[in-house]
């Protein structure tokens, strides 16, 4: 009996530019002889429904149809037919199929590969055209993929034990696609500093599929309206 097992859940998520290993494990009732077996990896793009050969291994012959693709012969001996792809790109997301032949038996498994890019975040103070005691803080998130992103603003006052989500005076712009396929977006918070308590911490919170925990950039309102620290005066408040 020949069986192939892929990543549990049927989906693997990998960061952009990572050296990804797409898992494929072979289970066979007898010891594997790699000279009399074959491994072929196929890829089907998210946009085209056509399957393309990525890598093949037959006996003493192996060929990478995607530059850098490799299946380790040493690991193959112990049943590990995982495919390593260095420098994975966004457009390489899709369905990967691992096909194993141990004559006369054949087994296969498929996995969806998702490529994600984590956003970078920076906080900027824009005072151009603002009224007295009014400030506009901009939270820029850039270089993320996929497009879905959630940006919220929170404040933490001195007195209350938990943060508070701010919903008023927040405008989040449309996402903009970059040349490399990643996205950028900016969210703005308008603050009337005369109505806020000094010592209140404001935070831009970015949640995205690529992040285990939210990305946070913060600033603290001081008694003097514009007394931001030097690091805050540049770009990054985090």
């Amino acid at each position: 009996d020949l069986k192939v097992e892929m990543m549990a859940g049927g989906t693997q998520i990998t960061p952009l530019n990572d050296n990804v290993t797409i898992f494929c494990n072979i289970f066979y009732s007898q010891p594997l002889n790699i000279t009399s077996m074959g491994i072929t990896w196929f890829w089907k793009s998210l946009t085209f429904d056509k399957e393309v050969k990525v890598f093949e291994f037959f006996g003493d012959h192996q060929e990478a149809f995607r530059p850098g693709a490799i299946v380790s012969p040493w690991r193959l001996k112990s049943g590990d037919a995982s495919l390593r792809l260095p420098g994975i790109q966004l457009e390489e997301a899709g369905e990967y199929r691992c096909e194993v032949v141990v004559t006369p038996l054949k087994a296969q498994g498929t996995v969806q590969l998702e490529v994600v890019a984590s956003p970078a975040s920076r906080l900027l103070l824009d005072q151009v055209g603002m009224k007295e005691n009014e400030d506009k803080y901009m939270c820029e998130s850039s270089g993320f993929y996929p497009e879905a992103i959630n940006i919220t603003w929170e404040k933490q006052t001195q007195k209350f034990p938990h943060p508070i989500e701010i919903s008023e005076d927040v405008i989040t712009g449309p996402t903009i696609k970059n040349m490399d396929g990643t996205f950028n977006v900016t969210s703005c918070l308008k603050l009337n500093s005369s109505q806020e308590d000094p010592g209140t911490v404001y935070q831009c919170v970015v949640r995205h599929a690529s992040l285990h925990t939210p990305l946070r950039s913060n600033f603290t309102l001081t008694a003097a309206r514009h007394s931001l620290s030097e690091t805050e005066k540049t770009d990054n408040f985090s």
């Epitope: 209350f160 034990p161 938990h162 943060p163 010592g199």
Partner: antibody, heavy 117, light 107 residues
């Protein structure tokens, strides 16, 4: 990292007073507000009051007004909660708690105060 | 004072179950609600703030929802360590008030 270390367990007679301390470390002490909570055995949580750690202001639960006093010693980064005219129903675990960051708020380990004749 | 009415007071469930705990505020508290988990002999640990935001490090199986007066804490797939007591808390105004708690027990 932030730590709130409270004083040890106390046994008091009815009518007496108790003073529980909470020593803070790992952050700029005076820029925070400290709350005090209590929990009677097998019961829920109850907010008693809070104090701004620069010592500027306090806010007490009406239920405890006149019996509770919260003070700060900034030189030792310690906050105190004193409860007077103790009765048996004041038997509880008393906690000091500080506003959190993004892993949640910080709590002391608790101080058990037993009021018994 | 704002009353927080939590239900049920106790709940029996099995590992892997999905459970929901509700909390009703006596007046509008917006989204100023937090949820705590408390294990026996330990200080409470905060799970959720602003009704629906998980604190960093809290497993994704915990989720909160609601606004105004009605709030829920949902545990999507119970793990053995989740069988303990949960409290809601409003923090829109002083005095801070808590629900009476929900004890989650193994069926």
């Amino acid at each position: 990292q932030v730590q709130l270390v409270q004083s040890g367990a106390e046994v008091k007679k009815p009518g007496a007073s108790v003073k529980v301390s909470c020593k803070a470390s790992g952050y700029t002490f005076t820029s925070y507000w400290m709350n005090w909570m209590r929990q009677a055995p097998g019961q829920g949580l109850e907010w008693m009051g809070g104090i701004y750690l620069s010592g500027e202001s306090t806010d007490y639960n009406e239920k405890f007004k006149g019996r509770v006093t919260m003070t700060v010693d900034t030189s030792t980064s310690t906050v105190y909660m004193e409860l007077s005219s103790l009765r048996s129903e004041d038997t509880a675990v008393y906690y000091c708690t500080r506003r959190g960051d993004y892993f949640g708020d910080f709590w002391g380990q608790g101080t058990l105060v037993t009021v018994s004749s | 004072d704002i009353q927080m009415t939590q239900s049920p007071s106790s709940l029996s469930a099995s590992v892997g179950d999905r459970v929901t705990i509700t909390c009703k505020a006596s007046q509008n508290v917006g989204k100023y609600v937090a949820w705590y988990q408390q294990k026996p002999g330990k200080a409470p640990k905060s799970l959720i703030y602003s009704a629906s935001n998980r604190y960093d490090g809290v497993p994704s199986r915990f989720s909160g929802s609601g606004s105004g007066t009605d709030f829920t804490l949902t545990i999507s797939s119970l793990q053995p360590e989740d069988f303990t007591t949960y409290y809601c808390q409003q923090y829109i105004s002083y005095p801070l008030t808590f629900g009476a708690g929900t004890k989650l027990e193994i069926k």
